[in-house]
């Protein structure tokens, strides 16, 4: 059941030539690093998880989403200092008692070996070698991502 | 003080021709509505503020940032129902005892006339006619934004 504003929006949009969509990110903005089909930005400063999420959002990007173990390893290879921790887009959902990516999907238990507790106010950080559960209030660095590949007619389904 | 990874990233990027930056959003993706130099997406579903922030982020967008009263009015004109509330990217910072946009800037007190309390766990919603402080846990709709204007050499300073 759509509101009139949503119907209107859909009508306006569907009357367009749909090939005039966002051309995607053709190459990475300055200061961002390319890793396969993504651009990554490793922060210089520190923030709690929530502020890190907000920072990525205002950069029109997302806290890092990691698809599988292979992507984790390739990301960790970019981290030069063993002791530095970076927030990624994964935190503990108390209501669902599970690790949840910020895109709404749940963690496949085989993907990451998390060190630490799965409990309220826990968020996930990565280092050069490991994946850690930390209090979300901990102030550490973070990683933002942008999708690199040009996408035509990219539709964003409502979550 | 930059880490080796960041120095490396800067070196790689600066050696490029800087005109090969992201071309920006040439027009709005399907389902998004154009409002001046922005694309807006009004959600169909409901979420607490934090999940709304995460949703916009995974869409490589931001919760709505409103520059001034004029932009507020133009946004409100797109809302058809007087009672429906939409989260925007503004919440109460307890440590700074002030309303703070997710981009880190503080609210100019003249911009929005907020109805309700300025206190911990308060986030800002807009309706067709007003601006309200609500508990951040309240599950309402939300508005994501993408900047529309093509920008060359867009640099994202670390917050």
């Amino acid at each position: 059941q759509k509101s009139s504003i949503e119907k209107c929006s859909v009508d306006i949009q569907q009357s367009r030539n749909k090939t005039t969509e966002r051309p995607g990110l053709l190459n990475c903005p300055i200061y961002w690093q390319q890793l396969r089909e993504k651009c990554l930005l490793f922060s210089h400063t520190v923030n709690p998880w929530n502020n890190s999420l907000a920072d990525c959002s205002t950069k029109e990007s997302s806290l890092l989403l990691i698809r599988d173990k292979d992507e984790l390893i390739h990301t960790q290879n970019l981290i030069r200092d063993k002791a530095i921790l970076f927030w990624i887009g994964l935190n503990f959902s108390l209501s669902e008692k599970n690790w949840k990516w910020i895109n709404g999907s749940f963690l496949n238990s085989n993907d990451l070996e998390i060190r630490g507790d799965a409990k309220e106010n826990s968020c996930i950080s990565i280092s050069q070698t490991s994946v850690y559960s930390e209090y979300c209030s901990t102030e550490i660095r973070w990683i933002c991502q942008k999708e690199l590949t040009p996408v035509r007619n990219k539709v964003y389904p409502d979550s | 003080q930059k880490s080796s990874i960041e120095k490396c990233s800067v070196d790689i990027q600066q050696s490029r021709n800087k005109t090969t930056e992201r071309p920006g959003l040439l027009n709005c993706p399907i389902y998004w509505q154009q409002l001046r130099e922005k694309c807006l997406l009004f959600s169909h579903t409901v979420n607490p503020w934090n999940n709304s922030l995460a949703d916009c982020s995974t869409k490589e967008s931001s919760l709505l940032l409103i520059r001034d009263k004029d932009e507020l009015i133009h946004t409100q004109n797109l809302i058809r129902d007087k009672a429906i509330l939409f989260w925007i990217g503004l919440n109460f910072s307890l440590s700074e005892k002030n309303w703070k946009w997710i981009n880190g800037s503080f609210l100019n007190s003249n911009d929005l006339e907020i109805r309700g309390d300025a206190k911990e766990n308060s986030c800002i919603s807009i309706s067709q006619t007003s601006v309200y402080s609500e508990y951040c846990s309240t599950e309402i709709r939300w508005i994501c934004q993408k900047e529309l204007t093509p920008v060359r050499n867009k640099v994202y300073p670390d917050s």
Epitope: - | L85, E139, I140
Partner: antibody
Framework: QVQLVESGGGLVKPGGSLRLSCAAS????????MSWIRQAPGKGLEWVSY????????AYADSVKGRFTISRDNAKNSLYLQMNSLRAEDTAVYYC???????????????WGRGTLVTVSS | DIQLTQSPSSVSASVGDRVTITCRAS??????LAWYQQKPGKAPKLLIY???ELQSGVPSRFSGSGSGTDFTLTISSLQPEDFATYYC??????????FGGGTKVEIK
């Protein structure tokens, strides 16, 4: 069609328990704040409890706090009210009601069930 | 808790009459007010929300006004199907969500 159907009412002795259910259909149940509202015979309306769409936020009227528990199962499109330590003054028709979507905790009840009668008497 | 006082408690009117019911809140509630119609043995029906917004499918002879503490429901031209009890309800974001005592609209 869009509807709410309550069940589970009946006669119960003071101190007893009942569990009311409300089956929702015809709309996306998981997007709505849901409430229980009651009406004693010949009297006015009294809001009892609400639950947020995700189930994360719950509130109760003082008259039932500590005795009644609201819950929901979005997968089953169902709302529940567990009523314990029932008293004679809990006798009423109990309505399941949906709030207008996206008005948050400003609850306007736009869809009601037909109600189920709970009688507490010895 | 916010108390709502409706007046009158009952009103006798004829078909075609203009009927006005008032609702006063014990403290300011901005525009967070609704009006419902209830017929005997039936569930209430939402007529007006946000003080003045007409709910979808409700005839335009019903209208609402007011903000703060004083609110009014007006039926511009009473129809036979409008004889019922009417309740106001405050919808500030803090429970409890109180209802007024009701106004019975009867046939004169």
């Amino acid at each position: 069609q869009v509807q709410l159907v309550e069940s589970g009412g009946g006669l119960v002795k003071p101190g007893g328990s009942l569990r009311l259910s409300c089956a929702a259909s015809g709309f996306t149940f998981a997007n709505y704040y849901m409430s229980w509202i009651r009406q004693a015979p010949g009297k006015g309306l009294e809001w009892v409890s609400y639950i947020s769409p995700s189930g994360a936020t719950i509130a109760y009227a003082d008259s039932v706090k500590g005795r009644f528990t609201i819950s929901r199962d979005n997968a089953k499109n169902s709302l529940y009210l567990q009523m314990n330590s029932l008293r004679a003054e809990d006798t009423a028709v109990y309505y399941c009601a949906r709030s207008l979507m996206a008005t948050g905790t400003h609850l306007y009840f736009d869809l009601w069930g037909r109600g189920t009668l709970v009688t507490v008497s010895s | 808790d916010i108390q709502l006082t409706q007046s009158p408690s009952s009103v006798s009117a004829s078909v075609g009459d203009r009927v006005t019911i008032t609702c006063r809140a014990s403290s300011g509630i901005s525009s967070w007010l609704a009006w419902y119609q209830q017929k005997p043995g039936k569930a209430p029906k939402l007529l007006i929300y946000a003080a003045s917004e007409l709910q979808s499918g409700v005839p335009s002879r019903f209208s609402g006004s007011g903000s703060g503490t004083d609110f009014t429901l007006t039926i511009s031209s009473l129809q036979p199907e409008d004889f019922a009890t009417y309740y106001c309800q405050q919808a500030t974001s803090f429970p409890p969500y109180t209802f007024g005592g009701g106004t019975k609209v009867e046939i004169k």
